[in-house]
Amino acid sequence: LEETLLNTKLETADLKWVTFPQVDGQWEELSGLDEEQHSVRTYEVCDVQRAPGQAHWLRTGWVPRRGAVHVYATLRFTMLECLSLPRAGRSCKETFTVFYYESDADTATALTPAWMENPYIKVDTVAAEHLTRKRPGAEATGKVNVKTLRLGPLSKAGFYLAFQDQGACMALLSLHLFYKKCAQLTVNLTRFPETVPRELVVPVAGSCVVDAVPAPGPSPSLYCREDGQWAEQPVTGCSCAPGFEAAEGNTKCRACAQGTFKPLSGEGSCQPCPANSHSNTIGSAVCQCRVGYFRARTDPRGAPCTTPPSAPRSVVSRLNGSSLHLEWSAPLESGGREDLTYALRCRECRPGGSCAPCGGDLTFDPGPRDLVEPWVVVRGLRPDFTYTFEVTALNGVSSLATGPVPFEPVNVTTDREVPPAVSDIRVTRSSPSSLSLAWAVPRAPSGAVLDYEVKYHEKGAEGPSSVRFLKTSENRAELRGLKRGASYLVQVRARSEAGYGPFGQEHHSQTQLDESEGWREQLA
């Protein structure tokens, strides 16, 4: 990038530069016409017959250097060919010399600094590549010479440029004074400021563009070269912040559009919001879950939003005494998650009707919660109780939802408790054809014993047809029509309002062989 300090092509008023000495044949300011047919201010000198050693000087106005260390001067000039000038003496030249003089203010006068090399600093002696001859018509009168010179290093506030003619016939068509600077550059989302090089190469620190953040590693820097070019080197730059993506050739970060998001800084573009989420603003790093949908704390920010599952279905209970097997089907809606578990809540109601959460005497296998399989076995149920089990399905976002958790209920009422087994049977009398039995009254938990059932059969006769039953309301019974001298196995059970209790242990009894023995009391 070039920053102009002076460009005579753009000047419309007279330049009014200073000449020395004030004599005929001196540099003269004239109007000219450039290649684009624009009128330009020019300086011409044509003293080809001058006395040897005499020089014509032309000095520009004071030019502030504006921080430039090296300044470039592009000269456009024409020069007549000495050979085509019949009256040109041997002093005719086809060169001229360029000088500069530095100062901290516009202090030069018509006579100072002295018009000579030192104090003026010589830049170069400029020779014409293209010489103008007498026109053979109206075509271009001669190619314009273009020469760029480098001044410096400069240290003072400004400078003058001076031209010394020693016998040329030439015109200075334009002077462009400029310095080179590295233009503001944005690369890899890193902005490097416009920089005037002070040395051969200057390191320049970059800064992240708006909505970008530095990438890990050393802070980005580029080198600005003296020629105004950035030195090519890889840039560990910046990356777009969450909610922003790189755009326009990695020169700026653009906010994610509505309905899209970018969760992390770095490369990558904005993605559509995942299922059941939305972003109503631009620049979203995360999409908000729809009402009723959530992300678990452990879910990635880019994960879809999920919802708690619906209730389990079709709970089936199988009661077996004080044990209950519950089984159910998975919920219709899993909520979009894989981490489905089940839990049970339990209430129990006593026969009298008072209800409370189930007590600690119940055991659940594998457990009351965090069940991954759809079944559980409950043990320790109390008789004649009504149990309500609520089976709920849960997932990773159930804890985030408000409102009631859907459940599938099941009611189970256990049987009332039957009398215990009758086991202490004794034979009070025996005869060849009968046995008189008695037993202790069992302690029935649910009311009095209403009656008893005696089950007996001859030992060795195991078939169903050989088994006989006898009911009695007392805690005794007489078994008649028995075989003489035969062995019998006897069992008794008691009945209360809750039903029959279990048969007790088999009791072994024997009838008498003959009558003479009579009735004999036997103690079991």
């Epitope: 004239l30 109007s31 016409l33 450039d34 047919q37 011409e44 044509c46 026109r135 009168t141 016939c169």
Partner: antibody, heavy 126, light 107 residues
């Protein structure tokens, strides 16, 4: 503004010669083209020739070749046009004119004449 | 020499009229053509050079166009001071030539 001042009116006999001068005041002279243009009474303009003083030699219209001589003196910034073998049809106002730009300060030489002398009437009569 | 033919030789027009004068070269002269205005008893005045470049100080109602062999001078809105004779002038050759002139008179 440069001025071109021409010599005064002349009355000449047929067969004679006339030399008209054109003095440029102020500034560069050598690198401008100086043209001579004549205008017979009631007629149009007629280009006769031109000189760029620094180059010395002039260019002439074919019609006047051999009869006209254009010269320049850089030391006095004066151009001259001499026409010989005068005839009555050479009666005219003779103008000198300077080009808008020097040969060095224009990319294309349009030889556009933006400075004119006041004209010199030359009458050829026996 | 290159011949320059102007047309018309003369024309009558009123103030405010748009006036067009043409000039034809006998061979290609690119854009090396100038236009001059001359009033009676005065030296010619340069109006346009290079076919279309307006000379400094000339009113913008004057314009020129053309290249090669056909050229035009246009006065967009004729003013009282514009009544004069107009000449084209080619400088393509080492030998310049003028057109014969076009007289613009008051109607």
């Amino acid at each position: 503004q440069v001025q071109l001042v021409q010599s005064g009116a002349e009355v000449k006999k047929p067969g004679s010669s006339v030399k008209v001068s054109c003095k440029a005041s102020g500034g560069t002279f050598s690198t401008y083209a100086i043209s001579w243009v004549r205008q017979a009474p009631g007629q149009g303009l007629e280009w006769m020739g031109e000189i760029i003083p620094i180059f010395g030699e002039a260019d002439y219209a074919q019609k006047f070749q051999g009869r006209v001589t254009i010269t320049a003196d850089e030391s006095t910034s004066t151009a001259y046009m001499e026409l010989s073998s005068l005839r009555s049809e050479d009666t005219a106002v003779y103008y000198c004119a300077r080009s808008s730009y020097t040969i060095l300060t224009t990319y294309y030489n349009y030889n556009a004449m933006d400075n004119w002398g006041q004209g010199t009437l030359v009458t050829v009569s026996s | 020499d290159i011949q320059m033919t102007q047309s018309p030789s003369s024309l009558s027009a009123s103030v405010g009229d748009r006036v067009t004068i043409t000039c034809r070269a006998s061979q290609n002269i690119n854009n090396f053509l100038n236009w001059y205005q001359q009033k009676p008893g005065k030296a010619p005045k340069l109006l346009i050079y290079g076919s279309s470049i307006l000379q400094s100080g000339v009113p913008s109602r004057f314009s020129g166009s053309g290249s090669g062999t056909d050229f035009t001078l246009t006065i967009s809105s004729l003013q009282p001071e514009d009544f004069a004779v107009y000449y084209c002038h080619q400088v393509s050759d080492t030998s310049d030539t003028f057109g014969q002139g076009t007289k613009v008179e008051i109607k």
